[in-house]
Interface confidence: medium
């Protein structure tokens, strides 16, 4: 740091004087010298460190008619709204040939009441959840001291007494404020007021109850409330993304879910309208008057194979003398499932129907006993899944086969000699 | 392997309490439920419910809400059946059985203890 | 509750028969249908879940099928070692509900 010589008697005629007041207090050092010849600059010292964006303004007046006479300079240095890093110690300092002089020392000094560096802030907490505050402040003067206050009640006995900085607080059961006082010799600086609201913990064993094709029966626990009850839940479904999933805490699924509102209790809600033998992900959410709980996590569920909603399509059955060929299309209706194949059921007016598994082949030619006497034969087929049989379709007559009609050739099926299957007509 | 071992047999009189462990070994205990399952002596099953060991959190059936309780010691892969209480109705074999992913119990009952025979004698 | 009911409390088979064991639900249960075996000494073992599906180290003669509410479970060629009671558990609907078993005895 620039120290002055004492070769020479100092210029200064005015030292800066000191400085004491609170936060965003408004002051102005002063140093005046008197020097021969062209004045020169005024720097501004802290604690022995040139200030290069001082606030300073300097005013020469000289004292005779002639530039080599002698001039007064006056150096102002303006502090606006005092902070702490203000504080220190002050000199003003020039170049005179090849010297320098700095002036005697002043002072500026922080004191008041206490500064808040961090304030509790507002949250949401669920309910009888653990969690904590947090609140600092300085002087000077030093020490402060913190008196944490619930809803205007002091948590200590006195300043200094209790929780200092970090208050924990083991839950809450309903929606209270919090503050902190900050004490030092000057006086009470409060803080802001931070409002905790307490919201429904988050619900519990989310988990499927039963399962239908089309709907899904799902149950949870409710998690504590506070002294609020809960209004309702909120449960969301997705589609499941094609083994993509949703992970588990996954903020967004990958389309908009189907939301559901149960009214509470019970906590179990059933979900219709979905598509059978599918996989989806629920979560579930639960609100009181205060606001929702946090969701859980998504979890993965699946509705069960239904049976095919419609009977195959576009039923055609011709004969020609003791063969008979059938075939059709897939049911049109939804299959609710995986197709595994067809059962047709054959009869004749005397005879006992007949029932036959077909596979998945959408074609059969039968070979019928005899030589094809029978009369008023009809065919029916209904397509199966693991769930089971979907509705048959309606009888159709045998018609006789037209020359001109193609006839393709197919693996003969002979008719058992006994039924085996009783289909009901 | 997956196992599960119980506790051994327990003779008590009426009013005490009982408290039944299983162990598990051969998989992560915590991603898959404990079932308690019932059996009175040449009688059926009879579910009792299970306990989610993510989470911790019980479901009873109907029949064994109150004097019943499921509870884990996590670190050990331990459940706990605690009956309180005790009567002569509670004279049977409890088992305990591995169940559900997570927090869904529908799954079939896949692993399940030797059982522990509960005595009741004035 | 959903009730299971297996009407064949007991049955006797010789060593190679096919045994037959059926089960019925109140409602449908959708496919959820479990079946166990308890061995004399009391240990029971998950054999057929899903009506049909084996659980791992089962032997192959066990075979479940059925929907809706009626189901069955089969043994193709009876061993000694398969003499046991049987239960059949719904797994659709909590609660969880059993059978009241079928004791196979071998003649």
């Known amino acids: 740091a620039p120290r002055g010589t004492q070769a020479e008697e100092s210029p200064f005629v005015g030292n800066p004087g000191n400085i004491t007041g609170a936060r965003g207090l408004t002051g102005t050092l002063r140093c005046q010298l008197q020097v021969q010849g062209e004045p020169p600059e005024v720097h501004w010292l802290r604690d022995g460190q040139i200030l290069e964006l001082a606030d300073s303004t300097q005013t020469q007046v000289p004292l005779g008619e002639d530039e080599q006479d002698d001039w007064i300079v006056v150096s102002q240095l303006r502090i606006t709204s005092l902070q702490l890093s203000d504080t220190g110690q002050y000199q003003c300092l020039v170049f005179l040939g090849h010297q320098t002089f700095v002036s005697q020392p002043g002072y500026v000094g922080l004191e008041g009441l206490p500064y808040f560096l961090e304030e509790p802030e507002d949250r949401t907490v669920a309910a009888n959840t653990p969690f904590n505050l947090s609140c600092q402040a300085q002087g000077p003067p030093e020490p402060v001291d913190l008196l944490w206050l619930q809803d205007a009640v002091p948590l200590a006995t006195a300043p200094g007494h209790g929780p200092q900085r970090s208050l924990h607080v083991p839950g809450l059961n309903k929606t209270s404020s919090f503050s902190c006082e900050a004490h030092n010799a000057k006086g009470v600086t409060t803080s802001r007021t931070a409002t905790i609201t307490v919201l429904p913990q988050q619900p519990r064993n989310l988990h499927l109850v039963s399962r239908q094709p089309t709907e899904l029966e799902v149950a949870w626990t409710p998690g504590l409330s506070g002294i609020y009850p809960l209004t309702h839940c909120t449960l969301q479904a997705v589609l499941s993304d094609d083994g993509m999933g949703i992970q588990a805490g996954e903020p967004d699924p990958p389309e908009e879910p189907l939301t559901s509102q149960a009214s509470v209790p019970p906590h179990q809600l059933r979900l219709g309208s979905l598509h059978p033998h599918t996989p989806y992900h629920i979560r579930v959410a639960c609100t009181s008057s205060q606001g929702p709980s946090s969701w859980t996590h998504w979890l993965p569920v699946e509705t069960p194979e239904g049976v095919p909603l419609g009977p195959p399509e576009n039923i055609s059955a011709t004969r020609n003398g003791s063969q008979a060929f059938v075939h059709w299309q897939e049911p049109r209706a939804p299959l609710q499932g995986t197709l595994l194949g067809y059962r047709l059921a054959y009869q004749g007016q005397d005879t006992p129907e007949v029932l036959m598994d077909i596979g998945l082949r959408q074609e059969v030619t039968l070979e019928l006993q005899g030589d094809g006497s029978v009369s008023n034969l009809t065919v029916c087929v209904a397509a199966y899944t693991a769930a089971g049989d979907g509705p048959w379709s309606l009888p159709v007559p045998l018609e006789a086969w037209r020359p001109g009609q193609a006839q393709p050739v197919h693996q003969l099926v002979k008719e058992p000699s006994t039924p085996a299957f009783s289909w009901p007509w | 392997q997956i196992q599960l071992v119980q506790s051994g047999p327990e003779l008590k009189k009426p009013g005490e309490t009982v408290k039944i462990s299983c162990k598990a070994s051969?998989?992560?205990?915590?991603?898959?439920?404990m079932n308690w399952v019932k059996q009175a002596p040449g009688k059926g099953l009879k579910w009792m419910g299970w306990?989610?060991?993510?989470?911790?959190?019980?479901t009873y059936a109907d029949d064994f809400k109150g004097r019943f309780a499921f509870s884990l010691e996590t670190s050990a892969s331990t459940a706990y059946l605690q009956i309180n209480n005790l009567t002569t109705e509670d004279m049977v074999t409890y088992f305990c059985?591995?169940?559900?992913?997570?927090?869904?119990?529908?799954?079939?009952?896949?692993?399940w203890g030797q059982g522990t025979s509960v005595t009741v004698s004035s | 509750d959903i009730q299971m009911t297996q009407t064949t409390s007991s049955l006797s088979a010789s060593l190679g028969d096919r045994v037959t064991i059926s089960c019925r639900a109140s409602?449908?249960?959708?496919?959820?249908l479990n079946w166990y075996q308890q061995k004399p000494d009391g240990t029971v073992k998950l054999l057929i879940y899903?009506?049909?599906r084996l659980h791992s180290g089962v032997p192959s003669r066990f075979s479940g099928s059925g929907s809706g509410t009626d189901y069955s479970l089969t043994i193709s060629n009876l061993e000694l070692e398969d003499v046991a009671t049987y239960f059949c558990?719904?797994?659709?609907?909590?609660?969880?509900?059993f059978g009241s078993g079928t004791k196979l005895e071998i003649k």
């Open positions: 059985a591995k169940g559900g992913y997570y927090s869904n119990p529908i799954y079939p009952m896949d692993y």
């Open positions: 051969g998989y992560t205990f915590t991603k898959y439920g």
């Open positions: 306990i989610n060991t993510y989470t911790g959190e019980p």
């Open positions: 409602q449908d249960i959708n496919n959820y």
């Open positions: 899903y009506i049909s």
């Open positions: 558990q719904q797994g659709n609907t909590l609660p969880f509900t």
